[in-house]
Amino acid sequence: HTAAQDNCTCPTNKMTVCSPDGPGGRCQCRALGSGMAVDCSTLTSKCLLLKARMSAPKNARTLVRPSEHALVDNDGLYDPDCDPEGRFKARQCNQTSVCWCVNSVGVRRTDKGDLSLRCDELVRTHHILIDLRHRPTAGAFNHSDLDAELRRLFRERYRLHPKFVAAVHYEQPTIQIELRQNTSQKAAGDVDIGDAAYYFERDIKGESLFQGRGGLDLRVRGEPLQVERTLIYYLDEIPPKFSMKRLTA
């Protein structure tokens, strides 16, 4: 696993503890909360990041709590169970033995149940719609410039291949970024769209997960793009299973 050998830190995840105890004295970094070794040349999985976030002491937390109106995966933050690869386990339970099934981005996709609840597989989120509202500007951004800048950002900051950025829509002041990545399209080593979306979401909130790198400075032809609202919608390869009571609520 990689990290800067001179000062032994993890460029892609500041919520790690790093020490030169890898093979040959190489720097190795482990995620807070889980203690799992992470690959610092790429994004850390959302599951490990959520676990690290929940393990941070409340009084030492440097992250801004979302307001009561913020939409955070419907159910808010929770301490997830991650598999040995750092992915979300299909079934998540809290300390009071309430359980539910989640998709590959950790969002609940069934009603809550008890310990007898079965989640047969981790259902892949293959389509993510990131809905942004930008602050007022003198004029609308040029759509093609905005499109190019957002694709460049996802490529160069999150290492997400542009083939997974399906579209960028713009109707001032709303920007929609569509990420698509089917199971069959995702090759070994490809960044997961769920992880890229999570890093982007945290960047937009001013809570960058990157170590020692400036926060997100989004500009379109030199004009700052300042986001004032973010909503993220997740579509799974298999539709979620909620009761009619929830659907009509």
């Epitope: 990689t2 990290a3 800067a4 050998q5 460029p11 892609t12 690959d39 610092c40 040349s41 790429t42 190019a148 694709r151 460049r152 490529r155 160069e156 900051r157 999150y158 290492r159 997400l160 291949h161 542009p162 083939k163 080593g189 960044v191 790198r213």
Partner: antibody, heavy 119, light 108 residues
Framework: QVQLQESGPGLVKPSGTLSLTCAVS?????????WSWVRQPPGKGLEWIGE???????SYNPSLKSRVTISVDKSKNQFSLKLNSVTAADTAMYYC????????????WGQGTLVTVSS | DIQMTQSPSTLSASVGDRVTITCRAS??????LAWYQQKPGKAPKLLIY???SLESGVPSRFSGSGSGTEFTLTISSLQPDDFATYYC??????????FGQGTRLEIK
């Protein structure tokens, strides 16, 4: 077998524009690869100029960005380089290359074309 | 920009020798490093990508290792065809692509 072939004038006048084209065979320019230009001044090392994706996304070396334009012609399965305001320092062997990965490493190269800037 | 520094600049060796070329990055680049071989009058040829993955068709005597800021290319048993100039290249996400200055491998 993927092949790349550079073409264009071998001599350009100072302050003029260097224009080169790279014809791609054995792969579609619309595949999920990057199409790059790299140059090498005589007896020196390699310098990345910039690259393009089939959708038109470009990325340029900041040291050359103000003078460079890379474009793609999907109908002809080729891509092109334009470098403005050239000087003798731009004399080099110019290579086109296919970039693999999200950020490019270069798995296929053209044989190169020497461009001399001189009056 | 990330600077890539290769050492040595020139290396003299004999057929059958084991040789090592080093490449250092000015900041951590993870394992996003490639190695190329270039012969006079020819285009570079990809040998190694992602620091240690051998490109298809490249002889197994070539190997790469390292991560972060320090990388090595090793040729386990030098063959006559291996005398050439070798370049490293970083392709980290957060910087323009840059190459090392090259290492010329010559016959002793």
């Amino acid at each position: 077998q993927v092949q790349l072939q550079e073409s264009g004038p071998g001599l350009v006048k100072p302050s003029g524009t260097l224009s080169l084209t790279c014809a791609v065979s054995g792969d579609s320019i619309s595949s999920h690869n990057w199409w790059s230009w790299v140059r090498q001044p005589p007896g020196k090392g390699l310098e990345w100029i910039g690259e393009i994706y089939h959708s038109g996304i470009t990325s340029y070396n900041p040291s050359l960005k103000s003078r460079v334009t890379i474009s793609v012609d999907k109908s002809k399965n080729q891509f092109s380089l334009k470098l403005n305001s050239v000087t003798a320092a731009d004399t080099a062997m110019y290579y086109c290359a296919r970039g693999s990965g999200v950020i490019s490493y270069f798995d296929y190269w053209g044989q190169g074309t020497l461009v001399t800037v001189s009056s | 920009d990330i600077q890539m520094t290769q050492s040595p600049s020139t290396l003299s060796a004999s057929v059958g020798d084991r040789v090592t070329i080093t490449c250092r990055a000015s900041q951590s680049i993870g394992n996003w490093l490639a190695w190329y071989q270039q012969k006079p009058g020819k285009a570079p040829k990809l040998l190694i990508y992602k620091a240690s993955s051998l490109e298809s068709g490249v002889p197994s005597r070539f190997s790469g290792s390292g991560s972060g800021t320090e990388f090595t290319l090793t040729i386990s048993s030098l063959q006559p065809d291996d005398f050439a100039t070798y370049y490293c290249q970083q392709y980290d996400s957060y910087s323009p692509i840059t190459f090392g200055q090259g290492t010329r491998l010559e016959i002793k």
